[in-house]
Interface confidence: medium
């Protein structure tokens, strides 16, 4: 029985392998059940986590996860070095940054060390699961009277990236949002001098160097203007 | 700050072949990994191939395999992509990247258009 799962974040279908063995019985084999999907994510090209939920296996397994790299002169399997642990059980593996050859295919495979034949492999292109730390550095300066230019860094490469920024003032119910390209800053150009502004901003690799879906975790917020929250019916809402 | 600047770009028919050149003026390229990628209109940049500095690296996207080579000089200063077989779908703009590791590119060229027809 040969199975393709869709695994989102724009990677290549996976193909599972289930192996079907002769049963007495009309119980399924082990080998049968259906292998954890693994989850990778890229975090800043610094290391990689690949994790598997390891509470759905009918008991405590301590599976095994092996890589390589597809069409590479050198695609020799590798062990995890690395096993990440939850309750004493394997539930993912770290690879380090020279592990990580982001414009490959990935190809990892989870294998039952007492059922050997039950296995299950995925290919990953791993320029798709990056997620860059949360910008950093915000900075504002007054452009002119009424206009507003926000600044901030990423430790990464900066044309690799595309930005979000949100807006509010502690009068409104809800952030205005903006896309920004490569260049990491932000103009807004009609600012209210009797409200208080909150700024905040998030990353994605996207789309020069990858097509990755999952944003960083947002900035820091910074603010701008007077605080007007005495008068603010909303402030104390939008906090929450 | 390494400059890359790529050549060997044109207009080929399909089935014929071109040679695109990168190089670092006047220096090595100073990084692990040389790789090239490529940008078809409308569509996002892609990985087409690349190599380590020591040579032993070399890797290449299914879409190329067997049809292109990169090779490296000696000196580390100019890195090959030889194009074989070229179809249609091969036509986009050709970027040479140079960087520390094969996960990231920290230096890129201007560009060089390869128009494949039929």
């Known amino acids: 029985l040969n199975t393709t799962i869709l695994t989102p974040n724009g990677n290549e279908d996976a193909t599972t392998d289930f192996f079907l063995t002769s049963m007495p019985t009309d119980s399924l084999s082990v080998s049968t059940l259906p292998l954890p999907e693994v989850q990778c994510f890229v975090f800043n090209v610094e290391y990689m986590n690949c994790t598997w939920n390891s509470s759905s296996e009918p008991q405590p397994t301590n599976l095994t996860l092996h890589y390589w790299y597809k069409n590479s002169d050198n695609d020799k399997v590798q062990k995890c070095s690395h096993y990440l642990f939850s309750e004493e059980i394997t539930s993912g593996c770290q690879l380090q940054k020279k592990e990580i050859h982001l414009y490959q295919t990935f190809v990892v495979q989870l294998q039952d060390p007492r059922e050997p034949r039950r296995q299950a492999t995925q290919m990953l292109k791993l320029q798709n699961l990056v997620i860059p730390w949360a910008p950093e550095n915000l900075t504002l300066r007054k452009l002119s009277e009424s206009q507003l230019e926000l600044n901030w860094n990423n430790r990464f490469l900066n044309h690799c990236l595309e930005h979000l920024v949100q807006y509010r003032t502690d009068w409104d119910h809800s952030w205005t949002e903006q896309s920004v390209d490569y260049r990491h800053k932000f103009s807004l150009p009609s600012v209210d001098g009797q409200k208080r502004y909150t700024f905040r901003v998030r990353s994605r690799f996207n789309p020069l160097c990858g097509s990755a879906q999952h944003w960083s975790e947002w900035s820091h917020p910074i603010h701008w203007g007077s605080n007007s929250s005495k008068e603010n019916p909303f402030l104390f809402a939008l906090e929450a | 700050q390494v400059q890359l600047v790529e050549s060997g770009g044109g207009l080929v028919q399909a089935g014929g072949s071109l040679t695109l050149s990168c190089a670092a003026p006047?220096?090595?390229?100073?990084?692990?990994?040389v790789g090239w990628f490529r940008q078809a209109p409308g569509k996002e940049r892609e990985f087409v191939a690349s190599?380590?500095?020591?040579?032993?690296?070399?890797y290449y996207d299914d879409s190329v395999k067997g049809r292109f080579t990169i090779s490296r000089n000696n000196a580390w200063n100019t890195v090959n992509l030889q194009m074989n077989s070229l179809k249609v779908e091969d036509t986009a703009v050709y970027y040479c990247?140079?960087?520390?590791?094969?996960?990231?590119?920290?230096?890129w060229g201007q560009g060089t258009q390869v128009t494949v027809s039929s």
């Open positions: 990247a140079a960087g520390d590791g094969w996960s990231t590119y920290d230096y």
């Open positions: 006047g220096r090595t390229f100073g990084t692990d990994v």
């Open positions: 190599i380590s500095r020591s040579g032993d690296g070399i």
